[in-house]
């Protein structure tokens, strides 16, 4: 499911409950995706010992995964709500190609991988409604994404395992950083 249980507009199981605000809905959506990532990481960590490796040992890779930096305005120091929101949305859009790559990488968690991908699309929509400066958001080029996907899928098995691990870890860190920032807004 692309949204957490109880979030669907058709869900009327709890009429006494206050409808969630935009911020609460975004918060809950991120936590839902993080739970999904956690389940996917369990499968990858059971298959290899990469999860025990230090970040330094895995730093040498050609992946250009989105990462929060001081200049993005999402940290406590130098916090800037508008700049940060643009970074979060841009970063999520950039992660979409990597989430597409993950789709055929799981045996027992295939549905979970799909849920993470679809939930991220919903999260982007939620955030775009919140953002005032949509013009500043750059959408990745579809042709570039297609060739990147082909390149990633052509890697040998070990590199594909490494790529899967790095995508999940980076996406988790990006979402955690995003959540911390959104909770300051």
């Amino acid at each position: 499911a692309p949204v957490p249980p109880g979030e669907d507009s058709k869900d009327v199981a709890a009429p006494h409950r206050q409808p969630l605000t935009s911020s609460e809905r975004i918060d809950k959506q991120i936590r839902y995706i993080l739970d999904g990532i956690s389940a996917l990481r369990k499968e990858t960590c059971n298959k290899s010992n990469m999860c025990e490796s230090s970040k330094e040992a895995l730093a040498e890779n050609n992946l250009n995964l989105p990462k929060m930096a001081e200049k993005d305005g999402c940290f406590q120091s130098g916090f800037n709500e508008e700049t940060c929101l643009v970074k979060i949305i841009t970063g999520l859009l950039e992660f979409e190609v990597y989430l597409e790559y993950l789709q055929n990488r799981f045996e027992s968690s295939e549905e979970q991988a799909r849920a993470v991908q679809m939930s991220t699309k919903v999260l982007i929509q939620f955030l775009q409604k919140k953002a005032k400066n949509l013009d500043a958001i750059t959408t990745p080029d579809p042709t570039t994404n297609a060739s990147l996907l082909t390149k990633l899928q052509a890697q040998n098995q070990w590199l594909q395992d490494m790529t899967t691990h790095l995508i999940l870890r980076s996406f988790k860190e990006f979402l955690q950083s995003s959540l911390r920032a959104l909770r300051q807004m």
Epitope: E56, E70, Q176, Q184
Partner: antibody, heavy 118, light 110 residues
Framework: CQSLEESGGRLVTPGTPLTLTCTAS????????VTWVRQAPGKGLEWIGI?????ETAYATSAIGRFTISKTSTTVDLKMTSLTAADTATYFC??????????????WGQGTLVTVSS | AYDMTQTPASVSAAVGGTVTIKCQAS??????LSWYQQKPGQRPKLLIY???TLASGVSSRFKGSGSGTEFTLTISDLECADAATYYC????????????FGGGTEVVVK
């Protein structure tokens, strides 16, 4: 066996800068968040700050500008400036396993005592 | 700013009895609350996280409950070894806060 150990605590005079170091054994700190907490004699726990990745930090309002946390793969430093007698406390570092979104500290060092006195 | 208020400051009960400690957040923190036990001269020990999940190796006599702004730690079948100070800690947001921890509750076992 995984453990944390703080070092660098000593008697200093007011205004002297001091750096405390938290060292990990049995695991790499690069995979975890690390927080600093202090406890004045006979008082409760006071949260100081946390370091997430290599460069994202958050601090308690009273620590902003005076305390700085930095990280390598094996250590986390707490740099303290403009120390006063009110900073006299046992300083603990603690690990957050960073697997979720909420901060919780499941591995603690034994603490290092900092005494600020003239 | 997610201030944590813990009550009472001190509580006393007999061996075999039950004590209840309350923790109140100034704003909703979902279920993102942990409880710690600290004995004199020792480091704190994580007991409960996510309001009600027992940390590894912690006795089931410790029970956490609550959500939003109101939380409770209940210790049943009190043992002498439970004599300690207990702290709640919000893990919802560590930005622009004075302290993530509550003021602490001393539990005296008679």
């Amino acid at each position: 066996c995984q453990s944390l150990e703080e070092s660098g605590g000593r008697l200093v005079t007011p205004g002297t800068p001091l750096t405390l170091t938290c060292t990990a054994s049995g695991f790499s700190l690069s995979n975890y968040y690390v927080t600093w907490v202090r406890q004045a004699p006979g008082k409760g726990l006071e949260w100081i700050g946390i370091i997430y990745g290599s460069d994202e930090t958050a601090y308690a309002t009273s620590a902003i500008g005076r305390f700085t946390i930095s990280k390598t793969s094996t250590t986390v430093d707490l740099k303290m400036t403009s120390l006063t007698a009110a900073d006299t406390a046992t300083y603990f570092c603690a690990r957050d396993d960073s697997s979720d979104w909420d901060a919780k500290f499941n591995l603690w060092g034994q603490g290092t005592l900092v005494t600020v006195s003239s | 700013a997610y201030d944590m208020t813990q009550t009472p400051a001190s509580v006393s009960a007999a061996v075999g009895g039950t004590v209840t400690i309350k923790c109140q957040a100034s704003q909703s923190i979902n279920n993102e609350l942990s409880w710690y036990q600290q004995k004199p001269g020792q480091r704190p020990k994580l007991l409960i996280y996510r309001a009600s999940t027992l940390a590894s190796g912690v006795s089931s006599r410790f029970k956490g409950s609550g959500s939003g702004t109101e939380f409770t730690l209940t210790i049943s079948d009190l043992e002498c070894a439970d004599a300690a100070t207990y702290y709640c800690q919000q893990g919802y947001s560590l930005r622009n806060i004075d302290n993530a921890f509550g003021g602490g509750t001393e539990v005296v076992v008679k």
